[in-house]
């Protein structure tokens, strides 16, 4: 049997040590034990006696079926404690009595069918995070449960099986900053959503299937909901039951953020939101992001048109990753305060985003994003693009360019744009020359001479350079980032004649470590305030007997460098 | 540049099963979806189906649901697609094509032709 | 399914005249804005190859004599002027709707 291997802080490291039983010889001077993926089975009431010190347990995934009533009687300190995907059938309240300074706390994952017959954490006043739950047994929430918590940050409940829900066990929690909730089914989810109105403030629902979710209204007088975000992970909707779950917003007032993550959409996006009020009450809400959407049908979705109005207010809006090949020219000119737009991993091509980005479309959109999609002429975005009067940031990067012409039409006030894995070889003057940042990053490029008076920041690490670009080119250049490239030198001239640069990274590069480098970077002390990643990223290239050293470290012999 | 490389030739016995390869090469594989059409001798084109190597979701048309299994293997970008049950209607060119746009494709294998035979 | 009927089956034309293909679809293959219409050439023992997409976007590399038009169910393409090069299969295709149809191919031939 292998031992533990602890540092001079007191952080013990036994994980995956096939032990069978807590090891022997645990110290007052240990601070934090991991024990996970054993096959402990048991802690008896002395195994851990003389941790007295000990701030971190966790014993993860270790086969654990048993342990004494007492077995942490003597953490006290104990801040961290994680039995996650054990074995416990059963928790006991006496467990948590001893252990008054936890902040963390994780059940998950153990064949408990309920958290026990009486509560178990009413000693645990400074607890911040619990996990509880698992998949297959946890069935019923009690309102014993969370008798004496009564502010958490996060709580995860993982109730997959979920029989029973006693009306207002939740309720007693008067502060959740952040509730995750795994519910295979709606079916107690309105009882549970009238508990935590007035405690939680960001309400994450993970797994649900939703599609035959029903709305009734609440039991609650007028609450002043906290709620300010609202998150669906993996949760399987249809119009119908999107136009429920709309119904709910008039409970939350003040809700600014809207999420779907991995979620399924059973529909055609025929959205019918039968209430006026829905539409006024989602007001508030100014940030939507959407991932990974599956549309089964998604030829036939509908153009939202449904939904306009719902939307005229929001300013954020992210579509990633959800096989959008068009947004349908009316939906683009109702998002009228719409600042932000990303539409990274989608089909787009220039040919159907001109129907997107039509006359009137996003009048105050400022930053655009296209990352990954289907675009394949620069020419022909910088031209589709000129309906955004107010657009100063654009990323397209990671899509296949043709090669670049010499001249684009760009937005006008455009500032900022990335360029970087396109794949392009040569930079021309169809970049505009408004840009204060450009991003060329990951690309091809073997040098870079384009004149940009107003350019502050420029992202060119992973290209082939072989020399700093020449300084002339940016009189007010701020910053600079040049790594892995094969730039082989710098000099006093070089970095002296950029004015204004404040920040050069051109690390990783092929240093040609000669006496002049060398020299240089050792008169030059101050270079560790301009390079962000001195010294351990420039090493010498060559000569040979150099190789591998770092330039801050490597002294030019004497002979070569006083011929 | 971009190249969509499909398996040779196959003569196959009824009832048989085939698997074609289509290797992609020139372009990131999993930002795009592939696609697969059938020629019969001196016919038509007719779409088979679809995937998206990034999800691996499947789209098919329902006259090859039960014929065709399409997969893809990202590390190595490329598509396969299998066919069961083969009978001499199944002799035909099998095309792979790589979808833009989400609605049109762009770029085609050079097609593998199966021959059902005994 | 929406069936694409291309018409004519095989059109004879002069070299360095017009050539006009048709193609109708059964229901419209408008999708808010844009025609999800695709017209494909096939020259004999090799794939084939797109010439238009959305009804009338040339692809890149396609020579300027190509066109298409068209919106709703009608569809055209055109060739003008027609080369030697350009005697062979044209085939359109709808992505309005699953499953993706084919039309049926007209064959150029020269008068």
């Known amino acids: 049997q292998e031992s533990l291997s602890c540092d001079a802080s007191g952080v013990c490291d036994g994980r995956s040590r096939s032990f069978t039983s807590i090891p022997s010889g645990l110290t007052a001077a240990m601070k934090s034990l991991d024990l996970s993926f054993n096959k402990i089975t048991y802690i008896g009431h002395g195994d851990l006696r003389a941790c007295a010190n000990l701030q971190v347990l966790i014993l993860k995934s270790s086969r654990i079926n048993t342990i004494e009533g007492d077995a942490f009687y003597s953490l006290g300190s104990l801040e961290h404690l994680d039995l996650s995907d054990n074995h416990l059938s059963s928790l006991s309240s006496s467990w948590f009595g001893p252990l008054s300074s936890l902040k963390y706390l994780n059940l998950m994952g153990n064949p408990y069918q309920t958290l026990g017959v009486t509560s178990l954490f009413p000693n645990l006043t400074n607890l911040q995070t619990l996990r509880i739950g698992n998949v297959e047994t946890f069935s019923e929430i009690r309102r014993i449960d969370f008798a004496g918590l009564t502010s958490l940050n996060e709580l995860e409940i993982k109730a997959l099986s979920l029989r029973n829900y006693q009306s207002q066990s939740l309720k007693s929690i008067r502060d959740i900053h952040h509730l995750t909730l795994h519910l295979s089914e709606s079916a107690f989810l309105l009882e549970i959503f009238a508990d935590i109105l007035s405690s939680v403030r960001y309400l994450e629902l993970r797994d649900t299937n939703l599609a035959r979710f029903q709305f009734s209204p609440l039991p609650v007088d007028e609450v002043s909901s906290p709620m300010k975000k609202l998150a669906f992970r993996g949760s399987v909707l249809t119009d119908e039951s999107f136009n429920e779950l709309l119904k709910l917003l008039r409970y939350i007032l003040e809700l600014s953020e809207v999420e779907f993550d991995d979620c399924t959409l059973n529909g055609l996006g025929d959205f019918n939101p039968s209430e006026s009020d829905v539409v006024s009450e989602l007001g508030k809400v100014e940030t939507v992001t959407i991932r990974r959407l599956h549309i089964p049908q998604f030829y036939l979705f509908y153009d939202l048109s449904t939904v306009y109005s719902l939307l005229e207010k929001v300013k954020r809006i992210t579509v990633e990753n959800s096989k959008v090949f068009l947004v349908p020219c009316s939906f683009s000119q109702h998002l009228k305060s719409l600042e932000f737009l990303d539409l990274s991993e989608n089909l787009m091509v220039e040919e159907y985003l001109k129907n997107s980005a039509c006359k009137g479309a996003w009048p105050s959109l400022q930053t655009l994003v296209l990352s990954q999609n289907h675009l394949r002429s620069m020419q022909k975005t910088g031209e589709i693009l000129l309906t955004l009067k107010n657009l100063t940031s654009l990323d397209i990067s990671r899509n296949t360019f043709h090669p670049m012409p010499d001249s684009c039409q760009w937005p006008e006030k455009m500032r900022f744009l990335n360029l970087s894995s396109t794949g392009i070889r040569v930079v021309k003057t169809c970049i505009p020359q408004t840009l204060e940042v450009l991003d060329v990053s990951n690309n091809n490029l073997d040098s870079f001479s384009l004149f940009l008076p107003r350019l502050q920041e420029l992202y060119i690490s992973r290209n082939k350079l072989k020399t700093l670009p020449d300084a002339s080119l940016f009189p007010v250049l701020l910053v600079m980032k040049i790594r892995e490239n094969a730039v082989s030198t710098f000099s006093k001239d070089q970095l002296g004649s950029f004015p204004k640069l404040e920040t050069l990274e051109a690390g990783d590069n092929h240093f040609v470590c000669s006496c002049e480098l060398l020299s240089f970077t050792m008169e030059t002390p101050a270079l560790a305030q301009i390079l962000v990643d001195w010294p351990d990223s420039y090493l010498c290239d060559s000569p040979p007997r150099l190789h591998g050293h770092r330039l801050q470290d490597a002294r030019p012999s004497v002979l070569e460098c006083h011929q | 540049q971009v190249q969509l490389q499909q398996s040779g030739p196959e003569l196959v016995n009824p009832g048989a099963s085939v698997k074609l390869s289509c290797k992609a090469s020139g372009f990131t594989f999993t930002t795009y979806g592939i696609n697969w059409v059938k020629q019969g001798p001196g016919q038509g084109l007719e779409w088979i189906g679809w995937i998206y190597p990034r999800d691996g979701s499947t789209n098919f048309n329902e006259n090859f649901k039960d014929k065709a299994a399409l997969t893809v293997d990202t590390s190595s970008s490329t598509a396969y697609m299998e066919l069961h049950s083969l009978t001499s209607e199944d002799s035909a060119v099998y095309f792979c094509?790589?979808?833009?746009?989400?609605?049109?494709?762009?770029?085609w294998g050079q097609g593998t032709t199966v021959t059902v035979s005994s | 399914d929406i069936e694409l009927t291309q018409s004519p089956a095989s059109l004879a034309v002069s070299l360095g005249q017009r050539a006009t293909i048709s193609c109708r679809a059964s229901?419209?293959?408008?999708?808010?804005?844009?025609?999800?219409m695709q017209w494909y050439q096939q020259k004999p023992g090799q794939p084939p190859k797109l010439l238009i997409f959305g009804a009338s976007n040339v692809e890149s590399g396609v020579p300027v004599r190509f066109s298409g038009s068209g919106s709703g169910t009608d569809f055209s393409l055109n060739i003008h002027p027609v080369e030697e090069d350009d005697i062979v299969m044209y085939f359109c295709?709808?992505?309005?709707?699953?499953?993706?149809?084919f039309g049926g191919g007209t064959k150029l031939e020269i008068k």
């Open positions: 229901e419209s293959v408008e999708y808010y804005g844009t025609s999800l």
């Open positions: 094509a790589r979808l833009t746009g989400g609605t049109f494709l762009d770029y």
């Open positions: 295709q709808q992505s309005r709707k699953l499953p993706w149809t």
